[in-house]
């Protein structure tokens, strides 16, 4: 799986999306978790509605909510409050039984907020020059990783 | 009416290549699971893996993985099940069937004839 | 890998008997069990999925009891059509596993 990255500003809210085919996971409930170290587990921060058919029901823990379209094929998880701790690896998941399926990597990137002046030179700006896969509502950009990026950063 | 038609029964030699097929029709066959099963003679059910021909998504249970490959071509509703080397003990009725998902579970529920393969210097 | 065990290994039951066929799990399942019949020189036939539901065209008198690492089918009133080999199958884990079977003869 490629890596998605995902950048919001923090003090905001940042939406994720993971698409993915419906008739594939059918009957299936999703989960969002957040990848612990390189190749820890992935601990689960929320997932949706027991009742599948009530997956389409925002589901929130804490500040993560997630919600799912089952006929369209997208989850949605919000991360509301955005904050620099929420930076890092997740994993979008399709569930059946004991198993969990990937459908998308996620890395979440937190901006400092443009009018907290105290950070104004660590800010970072996309120019237009550059691509994206997606632009999403709620102020959040993503891409995928490139080839020889990784998510975490060599541990000596 | 949803069915999958297996080829017919092979009579082959040791070291030989073979590709055996299930052919569905009557749903969309991009949106179904496909599994693959052995059965050796006098002997019970056996899962080898299971592919998704929407996106040739393929699952191997580990005793078949590097064994046998599955494949499927979405463009004629096949799904293909291969060897690259037989093996006397690779004699068995090996079935094909639909994984049907659904908010109760999911159901292998409906299956090939059966493909009948002897392998036999 | 989970380990299904089935018991008995072979049940002879007389026509109209009730007939009760175990199934157990290494290790919890959940519901995600099905049971299946096969007659010699058939495929088999989906008779249970989701631990309890019964596929379409199976008769009232197949029933499933159980969940977890434990669990029963049974056979109410024993038809002609009844006598065959039923495995079951569990897709909680991968990979997927069948039990051994349990076969029905007459007695």
């Known amino acids: 799986h490629n890596t998605t990255v995902f950048q919001g500003v923090a003090g905001q809210s940042l939406q994720v999306s993971c698409p993915y085919d419906s008739m594939k996971h059918w009957g299936r409930r999703k989960a969002w978790c957040r990848q612990l170290g390189e190749k820890g587990p992935c601990q689960r921060v929320v997932s949706t509605h027991n009742l599948w058919l009530l997956s389409f029901l925002r589901r929130w823990n804490g500040s993560t909510a997630i919600t799912d379209d089952t006929l369209g094929g997208t989850l949605t998880i919000t991360l509301r409050n955005l904050q620099p701790h929420d930076a890092g690896l997740y994993q979008c998941q399709s569930l059946h039984g004991s198993e969990a399926d990937t459908l998308r990597k996620v890395l979440v990137e937190v901006l400092a907020d443009p009018l907290d002046h105290r950070d104004a030179g660590d800010l970072w700006f996309p120019g237009e020059s550059e691509s994206f896969e997606d632009a999403h509502v709620e102020h959040s950009i993503s891409r995928s990783l490139l080839e020889g990026e990784i998510p975490f950063p060599p541990t000596s | 009416e949803v069915q999958l038609v297996q080829s017919g029964a092979e009579v082959k030699k040791p070291g030989e290549s073979l590709m055996i097929s299930c052919k569905g029709s009557?749903?969309?066959?991009?949106?179904?699971?496909i599994g693959w099963v052995r059965q050796m003679p006098g002997k019970g059910l056996e899962w080898m893996g299971i592919?998704?021909?929407?996106?040739?998504?393929?699952r191997y249970s580990p005793s078949f993985q590097g064994q046998v490959t599955i494949s499927a071509d979405k463009s004629i509703s096949t799904a293909y099940l291969q060897w690259s080397s037989l093996k006397a003990s690779d004699t068995a009725m090996y079935f094909c069937?639909?994984?049907?998902?659904?908010?109760?579970?999911?159901?292998?529920?409906?299956w090939g004839q059966g493909t009948l393969v002897t392998v036999s210097s | 890998e989970i380990v299904m065990t089935q018991s008995p290994a072979t049940l002879s039951v007389s026509p109209g008997e009730r007939a009760t066929l175990s199934c157990r799990a290494s290790?919890?399942?959940?519901?995600?069990l099905a049971w299946f019949q096969q007659k010699p020189g058939q495929a088999p036939r989906l008779l249970i999925y989701?631990?309890?539901t019964r596929a379409t065209g199976i008769p009232a008198r197949f029933s499933v009891s159980g969940s977890g690492t434990e669990f029963t089918l049974t056979i109410s009133s024993l038809q002609s059509e009844d006598f065959a080999v039923y495995y079951c199958?569990?897709?909680?884990?991968?990979?997927?596993?069948f039990g051994p079977g349990t076969k029905v003869d007459i007695k």
């Open positions: 069937a639909r994984r049907r998902q659904g908010i109760w579970g999911d159901a292998l529920d409906f």
């Open positions: 009557g749903y969309s066959f991009t949106s179904y699971w």
């Open positions: 592919i998704y021909p929407g996106d040739s998504d393929t």
């Open positions: 290790q919890s399942v959940s519901s995600n």
């Open positions: 989701g631990a309890s």
């Open positions: 199958l569990q897709d909680n884990n991968w990979p997927p596993t």
